[in-house]
């Protein structure tokens, strides 16, 4: 099944102490999916989207081993036929730097 989109979303961190927010969105026909965020291949966090939403935002603490940096990827899973879990392809990577550059 198709990969989710991934991007850093505001508020952007101004320092290493600030949290980072990474949004992961499945295609429109997969609401309520289970999402996994990876950093360098390691699981960082798992979240389930509300049934009326097709994505989640991972909120990662600043000043910890989980943030900042990257690369981060995300993936989602849905129940397919016969209640079998299906995993999406991995998203493109996203990296985090401090401070986030202005537009």
């Amino acid at each position: 099944i198709p990969a989710p989109s991934i991007r850093l979303v505001p508020p952007y961190p101004s320092s290493q102490e600030d949290p980072i927010h990474i949004a992961c969105m499945a295609p429109g026909n997969f609401p309520g999916a289970n999402f996994t965020l990876y950093r360098g291949g390691q699981v960082v966090q798992l979240l389930q989207a509300p049934t009326d939403q097709r994505g989640v935002t991972f909120n990662l603490s600043g000043g910890s081993s989980k943030a900042p940096g990257g690369p981060f990827h995300c993936q989602y899973g849905v129940l397919g036929e016969l209640n079998q879990s299906q995993l999406s392809d991995l998203s493109e990577p996203v990296n985090v730097s401090f401070p986030v550059p202005t537009w």
Partner: antibody, heavy 122, light 107 residues
Framework: QVQLQESGPGLVTPSETLSLTCTVS??????????WGWVRQPPGKGLEWIGS???????AHNPSLKSRVTMAVDTSKNQFSLSLSSVTAADTAVYFC??????????????WGQGTLVTVSS | AIRMTQSPSSLSASVGDRVTITCQAS??????LNWYQQKPGKAPKSLIY???SLQSGVPSKFSGSGSGTDFTLTISSLQPEDFATYYC?????????FGGGTKVEIK
């Protein structure tokens, strides 16, 4: 309909710690769609963001308050709290707790408590 | 921290007037801007998010526009219940910051 209610002492002695709790009713504090914040307003002045916390415990706070701010969340009680240490008269303000809505790039406070006045005085 | 500057700090207007409040950010914040209304002794109320999206339940006489550093809140036809103080707030980056407020008074 979600409601937020601040509670805590209205008078705090200088150099002591201000402690406030916000109780959330009508909705779960553990939703992935929300964050929980504190905003204050000195008498006759504007709004100042103090900090925000997520149900997971991830926090962000205003660096202007340096390291005086501590926030916590208690999912079992559907509450979150604020502690501000080493207070001075400049910390006298109405303190609001608020629920923030978060979806993709949207990020705003959509529900507020009524506010509680905290006076710092000896 | 990003500084948010509102103008004017206060204005006097009559019922039925079109009112415009401006908010300027000290750096580009894209459209990551919210507007709130606050009446005396009450908590703020969300009006506009993402610079131009109207909050559910807010009347369409309120509108927001702008992107980058310059933003505007417009009340198309001022009503008695609209006399209040209005604040902009950026959420481009931490720390979240508010403008100083614009008090809309009865002329």
């Amino acid at each position: 309909q979600v409601q937020l209610q601040e509670s805590g002492p209205g008078l705090v002695t200088p150099s002591e710690t201000l402690s406030l709790t916000c109780t959330v009713s009508g909705g779960s504090i553990s939703s992935v769609s929300y964050y929980w914040g504190w905003v204050r307003q000195p008498p006759g002045k504007g709004l100042e963001w103090i900090g925000s916390i997520y149900y997971s415990g991830t926090t962000a706070h205003n660096p202007s308050l340096k390291s005086r701010v501590t926030m916590a969340v208690d999912t079992s009680k559907n509450q979150f709290s604020l502690s501000l240490s080493s207070v001075t008269a400049a910390d006298t303000a109405v303190y609001f707790c608020a629920r923030g809505w978060r979806y993709y790039e949207d990020y705003y406070f959509d529900h507020w408590g009524q506010g509680t006045l905290v006076t710092v005085s000896s | 921290a990003i500084r948010m500057t509102q103008s004017p700090s206060s204005l006097s207007a009559s019922v039925g007037d079109r009112v415009t409040i401006t908010c300027q950010a000290s750096q580009d914040i894209s459209n990551y801007l919210n507007w709130y209304q606050q009446k005396p002794g009450k908590a703020p109320k969300s009006l506009i998010y993402a610079a131009s999206s109207l909050q559910s339940g807010v009347p369409s006489k309120f509108s927001g526009s702008g992107s980058g550093t310059d933003f505007t809140l417009t009340i198309s036809s001022l009503q008695p219940e609209d006399f209040a103080t209005y604040y902009c707030q950026q959420y481009y980056s931490y720390p979240l910051t508010f403008g100083g407020g614009t008090k809309v008074e009865i002329k």
